[in-house]
């Protein structure tokens, strides 16, 4: 299995390889097979990455930053493969690598441009700050700087704040949006153009539900087909907002098909789950169950948030007793 990296062919013996932070990659290089093979990989024409001649590695002059991180495909060298297997790439490894191959027949040099991208799975969070409601799209570690776009009811929003902190390796980005008093649906897209990877967060507010004490409530949560792929691992979490913080009622992991329920009155329909319907029931409502309920369906490529507001009112009996 080849490590995650893809090659873009460009003219003049130069290829572009795109790798992900901390993953392994292959810098490709091939030559016309011949005897007495010599292979030297260099970085930015200065630093010795890997040397092979007389049938074995010679790493005495290897730059320390490459120690224990490089190897060749030794069984393939006689077939003209001088590719370099490169472990755990970092952003500092970005740049131009030159592969020098000498044989009894000829000497060739190939250039490979390594670009490294980072895209730790972003998240969409719903937060209450005093009387304001915010949606926050954030990504803990991303490189290069991503493109973040917001839409309200499928219409792009021009103004969007971006709070950015840069570390040695990458950016950490928060993009908050004030949605106080809005009933619209919102979508946030974060795109890493280098890794050609896009993540989407979608937030939908459902109509408020009024229920009487002791009744049960059914809250819907179905993924939008545009984003949802049942083959992909995902997690579903139902939580309830109480005094500004969410407490988890239940969650479901698609990988293990496990359901964990923290609230005895909560129920999930197994058959509906198998049809990718994560609607839930909350039985025997009491007044303290009033509040906001959040269904979060998340995978590496999306987060779908559905908010329900439930108002539980005293039943007639309870009212007459008072």
């Amino acid at each position: 299995i080849f490590p995650l990296a893809f090659f873009i062919y460009v003219p003049m013996n130069e290829q572009i390889v795109i790798g992900r932070l901390d993953e392994d990659i292959i810098l490709p290089s091939s030559f016309e097979r011949g005897s007495e093979v010599v292979i030297h990989w260099k970085y930015q024409d200065s630093y010795k990455v890997h040397s092979y001649y007389k049938g074995s590695d010679h790493l005495e002059s290897q730059d320390p930053r490459y120690a224990n991180r490089t190897s060749l495909f030794y069984n393939e060298i006689q077939n003209g493969n001088a590719s370099l297997f490169f472990r755990r790439v970092s952003l500092l490894d970005e740049g131009i690598y030159t592969c020098y191959v000498g044989t009894a027949i000829q000497v060739i040099t190939n250039k490979v441009v390594l670009k490294v991208g980072v895209f730790l799975t972003p998240v969409m969070k719903y937060e209450k700050r005093n009387t304001n409601s915010f949606l926050i799209c954030s990504v803990l570690s991303v490189y290069p700087r991503p493109i973040i776009t917001w839409k309200m009811d499928n219409t792009p929003i021009s103004e969007n704040n971006m709070e950015e902190t840069g570390s040695l390796d990458s950016f950490s980005i928060n993009s908050p949006l004030n949605i106080t008093g809005s009933n619209s649906s919102y979508e946030c897209t974060i795109e890493n153009s280098l890794l050609k990877q896009t993540w989407t967060g979608r937030w939908t507010m459902k109509d408020g539900l009024h229920k009487m004490q002791s009744e049960h409530v059914s809250l819907s949560c179905q993924p939008v087909n545009d984003y949802f792929s049942p083959n992909q691992d995902f997690k579903v979490t139902w939580s309830r907002m109480k005094s500004g913080t969410f407490s988890v009622l239940a969650y479901y992991l698609s990988s293990s098909q496990n359901t964990i329920i923290n609230e005895s009155r909560f129920s999930w329909n197994k058959e509906l789950i198998n049809q990718s319907d994560f609607s839930m029931n909350l039985m025997d409502l009491n007044l303290s169950d009033s509040g906001e309920y959040l269904c979060n369906i998340s995978s590496d490529e999306y987060t779908l948030l559905t908010i329900h507001t439930v108002h539980v009112e005293p039943s007639q009996e309870t009212a007459s007793h008072n």
Partner: antibody, heavy 120, light 106 residues
């Protein structure tokens, strides 16, 4: 075709210096390690010095270490040997030699050589 | 340092003869050995590399064999153009030439 032409030889007194040059043509000079090899007429061959294809490493025979310096100018396709503190035993024909590859390989092309005579 | 002992130092032979020149290394050099031919007033010419690989363009009557410490250069049928001095070169650790074998007409 590969051509290596040495120059700069001559008669020099012991203790003095001399700089040999080698003009290379017919190949991509920067892709190959280069060497200097000397031969006393009627006697055997002795390897003198090596410079890697990229100039990053240089090696010398014990007999010349600390006195001779090998260098290259890839933009001019030229190899140099700076010889100082010359001794009578350095008298020889000095040949510029191309290695088949980058360093520590066999020699595949030789120049005709330039005579260096160290004598008072 | 690795010493190379070449024998014989002089070899008299006739056209059509099969001749063998030997090179012995003071320690193992694997197969990192080359053979050169030099004619008076000329630069040495590569014949064999890596003990037994024939350089492109060199006549097939030349062959090399051996590994470790014992190596031979064989000319299967001497031609008039083959009378010259032959040198072995070890390139396993730095470089050392043999003293040379002068091949002359008997």
């Amino acid at each position: 075709q590969v051509q290596l032409v040495e120059s700069g030889g001559g008669v020099v007194q012991p203790g003095r210096s001399l700089r040999l040059s080698c003009a290379a043509s017919g190949f991509t000079f920067s892709n190959y390690a280069m060497h200097w090899v000397r031969q006393v007429p009627g006697k055997g061959l002795e390897w003198v010095a090596l410079i890697w294809y990229d100039g990053s490493e240089k090696y010398y025979a014990d007999s010349v270490k600390g006195r001779f310096t090998i260098s290259r100018d890839d933009s001019k396709n030229t190899l140099f040997l700076q010889m100082s503190s010359l001794r009578a035993e350095d008298t020889a024909v000095y040949s510029c030699v191309r290695e088949y590859s980058s360093g520590w390989g066999y020699f595949d092309y030789w120049g005709q050589g330039t005579q260096v005579t160290v004598s008072s | 340092d690795i010493q190379m002992t070449q024998s014989p130092s002089t070899l008299s032979a006739s056209v059509g003869d099969r001749v063998t020149i030997t090179c012995r290394a003071s320690q193992s050099i694997s197969s990192w050995l080359a053979w050169y031919q030099q004619k008076p007033g000329k630069a040495p010419k590569l014949l064999i590399y890596k003990a037994s690989s024939l350089k492109s363009g060199v006549p097939s009557r030349f062959s090399g064999s051996g590994s470790g410490t014992e190596f031979t250069l064989t000319i299967s049928s001497l031609q008039p153009d083959d009378f010259a001095t032959y040198y072995c070169l070890q390139y396993n650790s730095y470089y050392t030439f043999g003293q040379g074998t002068k091949l002359e007409i008997k």
